[in-house]
Amino acid sequence: SGVFQLQLQEFINERGVLASGRPCEPGCRTFFRVCLKHFQAVVSPGPCTFGTVSTPVLGTNSFAVRDDSSGGGRNPLQLPFNFTWPGTFSLIIEAWHAPGDDLRPEALPPDALISKIAIQGSLAVGQNWLLDEQTSTLTRLRYSYRVICSDNYYGDNCSRLCKKRNDHFGHYVCQPDGNLSCLPGWTGEYCQQPICLSGCHEQNGYCSKPAECLCRPGWQGRLCNECIPHNGCRHGTCSTPWQCTCDEGWGGLFCDQDLNYCTHHSPCKNGATCSNSGQRSYTCTCRPGYTGVDCELELSECDSNPCRNGGSCKDQEDGYHCLCPPGYYGLHCEHSTLSCADSPCFNGGSCRERNQGANYACECPPNFTGSNCEKKVDRCTSNPCANGGQCLNRGPSRMCRCRPGFTGTYCELHVSDCARNPCAHGGTCHDLENGLMCTCPAGFSGRRCEVRTSIDACASSPCFNRATCYTDLSTDTFVCNCPYGFVGSRCEFPVGLPPSFPW
């Protein structure tokens, strides 16, 4: 779509005569008829295929034609066309004398024609005017012409429609050739796709306006390049969404089970050595002089009853000192000045002489000990109960009262709540300090995996076109991460399918 514009500049008819040579009375009141048509090697009469236009009376005999475009007038003359400009044309300009006010062809006598010019040639679309002058024996016409595109039409032949736009169907202006020039921040064939924040992850991020980065499900961060771990993941990370890969020393579905209590809590005191012995379980090996589950208790050196033969022990800064009873001597009162003749054995002990009567030894009945059978046996002095068990004297024997989670004569065995296989449907059992926990397979839940739930949403391979499937364990649904060029909840559709219509 465009306009052929013809600007009449000057018409000279000095003698004021018609084409027949007859003079006009009182002068030639001149108007013009213009015919624009397709290119003809020899311009001939016939339909004005590109259009016609007529002027009012512009002057008498000889006159200059005023440029009237600014005032909405008729110069230049406009010949609009609604087709692709072919680049060639034929133009006929006729000057007529108007004896009266009726300028219609049928109202004029045939001999009212003053002059007729016909030209043809090539004409490219452009802003520049082509100046021309046609002279006959009696008249001269000076004019210029050009072809320009109508508003919103572009290109060499005004065939490209383009309307600048700045809404959600496009953000662009039009180039001289009719191609779109996207406004800053927009891209795509129709400039309707925003350019996301620089670095925004191509698959995991998107945007609805320029310089934005919105994350798809399972991703986070300014550039949507950080996966979101499973909801409730405590001491773990992910490499794909909804994972929970445990940090070192942690276990369980949510990485909240402490497998390295020693490092994380340092429970052993006074320089004791800590050993992990299971989930939230540990053993402290005390340095000499300390006792207790966490080696938190300082031992008195007299607690081991080092003084024999009834000697009494006294703590000292650098150790201890034994006060021996009469008849005994030595660091631990271990040497006797007595013999069997002195009846040194108490509580029914039998005396046996040694070293030719210079010394003796007492053989003690059950429940008594000491070099003179003077001490009742305390079976707990050797701290025989492991894992913090409490030692209890029970007459001739002893027993260990174990802490929760331990059993055995000496509390040396770790109780496994998992031994009875409490987790149903193939659930994995984990011992806890005060009980157990079941990690259920896909499709089961509940404290003992006894409740049947939905199966792994990704198990049926719902994603197409080599898309990656992620199971959102919190909602039992899947998310397909599409490869480039595919869209849809299952990545089943290639991007940019050509439109089709219902007819």
Epitope: L161, H168, S208, V487, F493, P499, P502
Partner: antibody, heavy 121, light 106 residues
């Protein structure tokens, strides 16, 4: 061939919220070439554009209805939805969902068959 | 708000040309679509981008748009063309429909 199907209650009480869903079949709602719109037509009257949505969730609303309209999209179900709050009898109309094509400069080439929603107590 | 004005009705004899106008401020600078709607049916797109016809739409439907007026022309009108016709354009981010024109084939 692309098909659109509106669904939702045909009767809503005044001051309540009108809720409709449009299910798209035969094509993906996640295509970058389309917006998905809602248009309504009161009985015996002309068409009125309500608003539209892109698959990313970007929405555009008619200013005259903006305070009451919410349009959302669920790409996993290939659906988009309309909610119109505080309805009155003037909201009684046939509600259409349609596909607006970027390539067609916003022309709507596919329409649902329409669903009549009556607002009455 | 932006408005598009259409004549309420246009009558045409079979085989004649029907012209429906749609007026709006600088409408020529916007892309216009035209829809045909028959009673009890959904609208059908007959013209987009001022003058383009979707596949399946007969050649007798044509469109133009310049200045403040867009025109839908049905040449050689047939009885089956009797329907309501709506023009539509986009103003900023808002879709705007014309008031509609009822075409009656006499």
């Amino acid at each position: 061939e692309v098909q659109l199907q509106e669904s939702g209650p045909g009767l809503v009480k005044p001051s309540e919220t009108l809720s409709l869903t449009c299910t798209v079949s035969g094509g993906s709602i996640s295509s970058s070439s389309y917006y998905w719109g809602w248009i309504r037509q009161p009985p015996g009257k002309g068409l009125e554009w309500i608003g539209d949505i892109y698959y990313t969730g970007s929405t555009y609303y008619n200013p005259s209805l903006k305070s009451r309209v919410t349009i959302s999209v669920d790409t996993s179900k290939n659906q988009f939805s309309l909610k119109l709050s505080s309805v009155t009898a003037a909201d009684t109309a046939v509600y259409y969902c349609a596909r607006e094509d970027v390539i067609l400069r916003g022309g709507s080439d596919y329409w649902g068959q329409g669903t009549l929603v009556t607002v009455s107590s | 708000s932006y408005e598009l004005t259409q004549p309420p009705s246009v009558s045409v004899s079979p085989g004649q040309t029907a012209s429906i106008t749609c007026s709006g401020d600088t409408l020529g600078d916007k892309y216009v679509s035209w829809y045909q709607q028959k009673p009890g049916q959904s609208p059908v797109l007959v013209i987009y981008e001022d003058s383009e016809r979707p596949s399946g739409i007969p050649e007798r439907f044509s469109g133009s748009n310049s200045g403040d007026t867009a025109t839908l022309t049905i040449s050689g009108t047939q009885p089956m063309d009797e329907a309501d016709y709506y023009c539509q354009a986009w103003d900023s981010e808002t879709g705007v429909f014309g008031s509609g024109t009822k075409v009656t084939v006499l």
